[in-house]
């Protein structure tokens, strides 16, 4: 495919990435799928600057990001290393809380109303953010 040089309509550019901010809610898996269908992924926060940028755009609203531990360890959806990467958890989080009564623990990460992160039940219908890198090849066939 050809290399993407500018962001799609309704996406916001920041530091060579494009971001799309939902205004409705979906379960984490549905949000993840939505981003994949857009040739993107749920947002992967790699720095303090990116955290502040996303936080500015989403406001004080619970919003899914591309971080989960559904298979054991915490993983970013694009393969970015979790252990050495940026983290912004609320105090005492993540806690894999079972007391919500919805079955299981909490396996998906979201931005809370103050921007810090929390783990929550993946089925909750939160807003979400998609991200795609400008420098990666798009899946669209090249124009002949």
């Amino acid at each position: 495919g050809s290399e993407r040089t500018c962001c799609p309509v309704n996406w916001v550019e920041h530091e060579r990435s494009c971001y799309w901010f939902s205004r409705s809610g979906k379960a984490w898996a549905d949000a993840d799928n939505y981003c994949r269908l857009e040739d993107a992924h749920l947002v992967v926060v790699t720095s303090w600057e990116e955290q502040k940028f996303v936080q500015h755009h989403i406001g004080p609203v619970n919003t899914w990001m591309g971080l989960h531990d559904q298979n054991g360890p915490w993983k970013w959806v694009d393969g970015t290393d979790y252990e050495t990467g940026f983290k912004n958890w609320r105090p005492e989080q993540p806690d894999d809380w079972y007391g919500h009564g919805l079955g299981g623990g909490e396996d998906c990460a979201h931005f809370t109303d103050d921007g810090r992160w929390n783990d929550d039940v993946c089925q909750r219908p939160y807003r979400w953010v998609c991200e795609t890198e400008l420098d990666k090849a798009s899946q669209e066939p090249p124009l002949l």
Epitope: T46, S47, W48, E49, K52, P60, T84, G85, F86, K87, N88, D113, D114, G115, R116
Partner: antibody, heavy 117, light 107 residues
Framework: QVQLVQSGAEVKKPGASVKVSCKAS????????FHWVRQAPGQGLEWMGW????????NYAQKFQGRVTMTRDTSISTAYMELSRLRSDDTAVYYC??????????WGQGTLVTVSS | DIQMTQSPSSVSASVGDRVTITCRAS??????LAWYQQKPGKAPNLLIY???SLQSGVPSRFSGSGSGTDFTLTISSLQPEDFATYYC?????????FGPGTKVDLK
């Protein structure tokens, strides 16, 4: 112009607490994170944590968790840093700093805290 | 935590000299690095942010470069007021960490 003015020097005994203030002017106080950094005599700079004046969220360096509390009073555009259970190695100049783009773009003048019995 | 190292730890130079200070991060920090100047008894003063952007009001003889793990601060022509200690700082992830400093003094 942006200004951060800190409270005066303090002398404390080991085990006591100290509360340093930092009054901001020249910009929207609630719009930017506030950081606290300290510097022991003749030593380098050490980040202690941040507070966001808009929502009171905090993030403390692990080294200081359980001993530091960062607060703010938006009505007077002032941030506070309280450090408890003081030890002699907490003797340092404590700075507040405004968050900038991948940096601390404005700093207070510093507050010397001396811990001595 | 991300460790920051600086070299040299001190440098003796004369007015008009070109001075280069390097900073290395123990892991990749993209370009999220700042440089500060500190004089005795004073607070640090921001010179460079985002590795290469000059802070407003800072003379153009100061410049920064690098990304990833290796960064450089250059003073193209040292002036009398530039004798000070210089610190790098990573602003990529918590806890934010500083280099140990480089003291620039008169030869």
């Amino acid at each position: 112009q942006v200004q951060l003015v800190q409270s005066g020097a303090e002398v404390k005994k080991p085990g006591a607490s100290v509360k340093v203030s930092c009054k901001a002017s020249g910009y929207t106080f609630t719009g930017y994170y506030f950081h606290w950094v300290r510097q022991a005599p003749g030593q380098g700079l050490e980040w202690m944590g941040w507070i966001h004046p808009n929502n009171n969220a905090t993030n403390y360096a692990q080294k200081f968790q359980g001993r530091v509390t960062m607060t703010r009073d938006t009505s007077i555009s002032t941030a506070y840093m309280e450090l408890s259970r003081l030890r002699s190695d907490d003797t340092a100049v404590y700075y507040c700093a405004k968050d900038g783009r991948s940096s601390f773009d404005y700093w207070g003048q510093g507050t010397l805290v001396t811990v001595s019995s | 935590d991300i460790q920051m190292t600086q070299s040299p730890s001190s440098v003796s130079a004369s007015v008009g000299d070109r001075v280069t200070i390097t900073c290395r991060a123990s892991q990749v920090i993209s370009r999220w690095l700042a440089w500060y100047q500190q004089k005795p008894g004073k607070a640090p003063n921001l010179l460079i942010y985002a590795a290469s952007s000059l802070q407003s009001g800072v003379p153009s003889r100061f410049s920064g470069s690098g990304s990833g793990t290796d960064f450089t601060l250059t003073i193209s022509s040292l002036q009398p007021e530039d004798f000070a200690t210089y610190y790098c700082q990573q602003a990529n992830s918590f806890p934010f960490t500083f280099g140990p400093g480089t003291k620039v003094d008169l030869k």
